[in-house]
Interface confidence: medium
């Protein structure tokens, strides 16, 4: 799981955008990926990175019985 996320995050070279990806990866079932992404005001590149990483991480967890995937700062 972590390898796959790192692979996706590596696409984002800008540190701010990369952080947006990691923010999306963090487990948060208070709202869906789309709902959370809609609240981001940093900019469209951040929204795109957040959404892609959030959805991929959620799908990976769904295929792995939702084991925790806590990626760092």
């Amino acid at each position: 799981l972590q390898e796959k996320i790192e692979e996706i995050a590596a696409k984002y070279k800008h540190l701010v955008v990369k952080k947006c990806c990691y923010d999306g990866v963090r487990i948060n079932h208070d709202e869906t990926c789309e709902q959370r992404a809609a609240r981001i005001s940093v900019g469209p590149r951040c929204v795109k990175a957040f959404t892609e990483c959030c959805v991929v991480a959620s799908q990976l967890r769904a295929n792995n019985s939702h084991k925790d995937l806590q990626l760092g700062r």
């Epitope: 709202e31 869906t32 981001i40």
Partner: antibody
Framework: EMQLVESGGGLVQPGGSLRLSCAAS????????MQWVRQAPGKGPEWVGL??????????QYAASVKGRFTISRDDSKNSVYLQMNSLKTEDTAVYYC??????????WGQGVLVTVSS | DIVMTQSPLSLPVTPGEPASISCRSS???????????IDWYLQKPGQSPQLLIY???NRASGVPDRFSGSGSGTDFTLKISRVEAEDVGVYFC?????????FGQGTKLEIK
């Protein structure tokens, strides 16, 4: 191990105000949404509201029954979330729980604090 | 708001026998990220609610394997394969697919 500890409950007259606090520990507080849920005596739980983490704006959302009267705030430097309750009504009498989806999936609940609104 | 309809509201069970609780939502709780946004909680007398099942079918850490959750979309079920005396309390489902989160009415499980 994550822990949520509420404080500030008590007896207040209708129309009065009260501020509840929730001290969190055992997780990276600033990364997570924080919520309040209440439970009136003999009833089921009722969602009160939430405050989002800064990554998605730190905004708040409330149940229709408390909107305009209750305010949720957070202080990430103190790992604390607050519920300011104004214009309290007798129907606000309940045990108030601080809850979060930090740590394990699903909601983790504090021990709860009783708020009694009565004259 | 999404309405959660839980049944039965009262459930008398003989120890060792199975038990089943249903929760039906007025809208689908399955999001495009593949997750069913529903939890099951047990509130024992005088205690805070405790998580049993998340995501519709994932057993929380420390929860005995006699508890299981199933379903997707709008219909969900919590099953206890063999009820024990310590299982008494009120069981709630909770949807968090959309704000505001909404709870089922609760099912009071009691031992016959």
């Amino acid at each position: 191990e994550m822990q949520l500890v509420e404080s500030g409950g008590g007896l207040v007259q209708p129309g009065g105000s009260l501020r509840l606090s929730c001290a969190a520990s055992g997780f990276t507080f600033s990364d997570y949404y924080m919520q309040w849920v209440r439970q009136a005596p003999g009833k089921g739980p009722e969602w009160v509201g939430l405050i989002r983490n800064k990554a998605v704006g730190g905004t708040t959302q409330y149940a229709a029954s408390v909107k305009g009267r209750f305010t949720i705030s957070r202080d990430d430097s103190k790992n604390s979330v607050y519920l300011q309750m104004n214009s309290l009504k007798t129907e606000d009498t309940a045990v108030y729980y601080c809850v979060s989806r930090a740590g394990p999936p699903g909601l983790s609940w504090g021990q709860g604090v009783l708020v009694t609104v009565s004259s | 708001d999404i309405v959660m309809t839980q049944s039965p509201l009262s459930l008398p069970v003989t120890p060792g026998e199975p038990a089943s609780i249903s929760c039906r939502s007025s809208q689908s709780l399955l999001a495009s990220d593949g997750y069913n946004y529903i939890d099951w909680y047990l509130q024992k007398p005088g205690q805070s609610p405790q998580l049993l099942i998340y995501g519709g079918s994932n057993r929380a850490s420390g929860v005995p394997d006699r508890f299981s959750g199933s379903g997707s979309g709008t219909d969900f079920t919590l099953k206890i394969s063999r009820v024990e005396a310590e299982d008494v309390g009120v069981y709630f489902c909770l949807q968090h697919r959309a704000l505001p989160p909404t709870f089922g009415q609760g099912t009071k499980l009691e031992i016959k």
